[in-house]
Structures are given as structure tokens and as C-alpha cells.
Interface confidence: low
Amino acid sequence: NFMYSKTVKRLSKLREYQQYHPSLTCVMEGKDIEDWSCCPTPWTSFQSSCYFISTGMQSWTKSQKNCSVMGADLVVINTREEQDFIIQNLKRNSSYFLGLSDPGGRRHWQWVDQTPYNENVTFWHSGEPNNLDERCAIINFRSSEEWGWNDIHCHVPQKSICKMKKIYI
């Protein structure tokens, strides 16, 4: 029976992921019952990715490690639409680390997942980045210009945003 074997495969995949995420929330993609896309509970989903807002305050290093333990990375923002989705889940009085850093302090910004840094798709606050010693990026809210990015010292603890690809079962 086709449906039975598909269900068995799904269950074995779910067991495989359980070591990282005890609970997954899955939805059917389109009209085809064969394709389910899942995010860990209580992560949120947008397009082909899952997002988790980590409210623990940690350095950039520890924030990235925290994401990687969950099979994710600090968030890489590729589009305005993606950022608009993410900010719906953020608190205005907090700052959140992004997966964007400038390790050499030479304004050579790099995303953690190796996505090329594209100056045309950046959302820096006006006047930012502004300090060569501030080598990690956060997203925060400024009343004058709403949500945008700022460079800060990497060791200063902040909240963070993790992102991972959806799990397809």
C-alpha cells in the first residue's frame, strides 16, 4: 500500500529529527498529500525556512553556537519581505543578533551560511555601520526609521534569531 509505506517513511524521518527537535509542526504543501513541510515547535515558518527567536542574552559566538546545536544558523536575511516577516515576532525594546559579521574589521561583511553579502539588499540604519571595532550585526528598532541593522561589539550579550531550512518529510 503506497500510503502506508509513505507513512512509515515519514515516521522514521520524524524519529531521526527527534534527537534535535522533540516536536515538529507540519503542514501539507500545496494539494499533494505526499509533501509535508515541518518546523520545530514553536518555531515560525516563512517560505522555505523556519525561525526561532532566542530570548536568552548571549554573545554573537554563543548565539551562533546555540543556533547550530539546533541545526540552524543565526538568521541570514535575503529580502525585504523576509525581514518584514521576522520583525512581526520581535520586541521593539530589544536587539537581536543576525548571522552577519565582519571578523577582520575591514567592512568585509559576511553571512554565516556563505550567502554572498549584497550591498543592495541591506537594511542598515542611517549612519550604520559606523565602527570598525563593532564587527557583528544586530537588528533593532529606532523610532525615527523603524527596524534596521546596526554594528555592535560581538561580545555584548543580545537576543538572537535562528534560521533553518524547513524539514520536508
Partner: nanobody, 123 residues
Framework: QVQLQESGGGLVQAGGSLRLSCAVS????????MGWFRQARGKEREFVAA????????FYTDSVKGRFAISRDIAKNTVYLQMNSLKPEDTAVYYC????????????????WGQGTQVTVSS
Amino acid sequence: QVQLQESGGGLVQAGGSLRLSCAVSGRTFSSYAMGWFRQARGKEREFVAAVEWSSGSTFYTDSVKGRFAISRDIAKNTVYLQMNSLKPEDTAVYYCAGDHTGKLVFSKTSDYWGQGTQVTVSS
């Protein structure tokens, strides 16, 4: 598929030198970085040094600064770790790694690892 192959490990007396090599095949890391990590028996793997592939910028852990030098040869797709004034506490398996600079330097993690080469420093 990325493959990293280390060589150059061995047994050396305290105060001596060794040069490790790591040959990269399968892809180049362009604007990313190559690094060395080490793992002593019973301890966690720790970051040693990294070099940014395009700019040549180097990064070291404090305990090896002034003694170890990392470099890369773009034409040969190889990264080197010159280790001088070796100490018994440098004894470990040394692993080559390649990844985004921020991941190597800040997070001390990588998605790409070599098999490792043993370095033993006797007193």
C-alpha cells in the same frame, strides 16, 4: 564534495618545529576561510588559527600567537600551519577546516573537516 587532506604531523621534541599542510579539493573557499583546530586526548576540539582565503587576514588563539603562523597558497589550494617553539601542551590531533570566516573565527565551528594529523611534542 569538499575534501580536506592534512599532512605533516609527527613526533618532535619540545622547542622544535613542524609544518602542517592541508590540501583542499572539490571547491575553493573564495572569500571564506581555512583554519586549523586541535583536539588533545580527553579534551574538546579547540580553534588554533584561521586565514581568510581572499585577503590573507589571519586569526590566532592566544596560546599560539607568536609561535604559530598560518598561511595559504591560492595556486596550490593549500593552507599551511608553521608551528615553532612547540610545547608538550601542543600535543593533539590537528584538524583542517574550511568555512565562512565568522563561523570559524567567532563560533569556532565548521561544516567541513579533514581527517586530522597527530602532532606529539615530547619533553
